[in-house]
């Protein structure tokens, strides 16, 4: 039987257009679903806000690549957080919908902070 | 619903080249990397390369280049992977693939080439 | 480039056994390694990234483990749909590459 997550499905619409300082950043999400129009990165800072950038870019394959590398440095408690733990505040250009989604997004986060403009999330049942 | 459509099956001669297909729907191509990937008869799986189809950037695993040349058109929102010079050696079932981060979440149902001599 | 091997390229397995598969990488992968299911005729399936993230559909039988170079995909009661040959990918660096493969047998 399949495993599934009833938590709300996490989409980017736009990416910023913005280099948010690496300082800033704790962590960040792949997101992959098929139900979201485009893949993307959503990275978290260090204030909890939630930021999508488009995965093309160079810069934001370079902070991935950084975050993943500094995670192997942080305490194992802190390599994965739930996806319920970083919707604390909206994402920039995210609409949060309601659907069962296993893996929606992954999560990956270090201990390497924030201003970023938060977007009204949508939960739809 | 993301589909990969691969034409099943090419028979193409020693020395000939070929240009194998891969339509996409349920996405729009130019949001993500098309790769492809090699199957040889009864053996692993080798990245051949991927393509940006925004821009027309592409990628190589060295040990094909030469050897392949991957383009896209994103008016019919299409990936291509031509292969050139063909002996038994690229007899393989060729897989497309789409995935922004290197690793593949949908796959074609593959093309399986034919070399002979 | 990245070399990655499964030690195993088969293994026989009862129905309901607990199965590990092995995977290790010639350097630190930091995490970004995949699972793939192949049935004979059929493309690969993605099951896990990042090394332990469930893909949407799989079951949860399935597990992803490791870190640094060594990484392991576990099925704690094997199921029938199960046999298949499985290979992981790392995704740290182009050219990526894969595990030669374990393909599971029904003893």
């Known amino acids: 039987q399949p495993d599934a997550v009833n938590a709300p499905l996490t989409c980017c619409y736009s990416f910023t257009s913005k280099m948010i300082p690496m300082s800033r950043l704790e962590s960040y999400k792949r997101i992959t679903s098929s139900r979201c129009p485009k893949e993307a990165v959503v990275f978290v800072t260090k204030l909890k806000r939630e930021v999508c950038a488009d995965p093309k870019k160079e810069w934001v394959q370079t902070y991935i690549k950084n975050l993943d590398r500094n995670q192997m440095r942080s305490e194992p408690t802190t390599l994965f957080k739930t996806a319920s733990a970083l919707r604390s505040s909206a994402p920039l250009n995210v609409k949060l919908t309601r659907k069962s989604e296993a893996n929606a997004s992954t999560t990956f986060s270090t201990t390497t902070s924030s201003t970023s403009v938060g977007v009204t999330s949508v939960t739809v049942n | 619903e993301v589909q990969l459509q691969q034409s099943g099956a090419e028979l193409v001669k020693a020395g000939a080249s070929v240009k194998l297909s891969c339509p996409a729907s349920g996405l729009n191509i130019k949001d993500t990397y098309m790769h492809w990937v090699k199957q040889r008869p009864e053996q692993g799986l080798e990245w051949i390369g991927r393509i940006d189809p925004a821009n027309g950037n592409t990628k190589f695993d060295p040990k094909f280049q030469g050897k392949a040349t991957i383009t896209a058109d994103t008016s019919s929102n299409t990936a291509y992977l031509q292969l050139s010079s063909l002996t038994s050696e690229d007899t393989a079932v060729y897989y497309c693939a789409r995935g922004v981060f290197g690793f593949f979440d949908y796959w074609g149902q593959g093309t399986t080439l034919t070399v002979s001599s | 480039d990245i070399q990655m091997t499964q030690s195993s390229s088969s293994f026989s397995v009862s129905l309901g056994d607990r199965v590990t598969i092995t995977c290790k990488a010639t350097e630190d992968i930091y995490n970004r390694l995949a699972w793939y299911q192949q049935k004979p005729g059929s493309a690969p399936r993605l099951l896990i990234s990042?090394?332990?993230s469930l893909e949407t559909g799989v079951p949860s039988r399935f597990s992803g483990s490791g870190s640094g170079k060594d990484y392991t995909l576990s099925i704690t009661s094997l199921q029938t749909e199960d046999v298949a040959t499985y290979y992981c990918?790392?995704?740290?660096?182009?050219?990526?590459?894969f595990g030669g493969g374990t393909k599971l047998e029904i003893k």
């Open positions: 990918q790392q995704f740290w660096s182009a050219p990526y590459t």
């Open positions: 990042g090394a332990t």
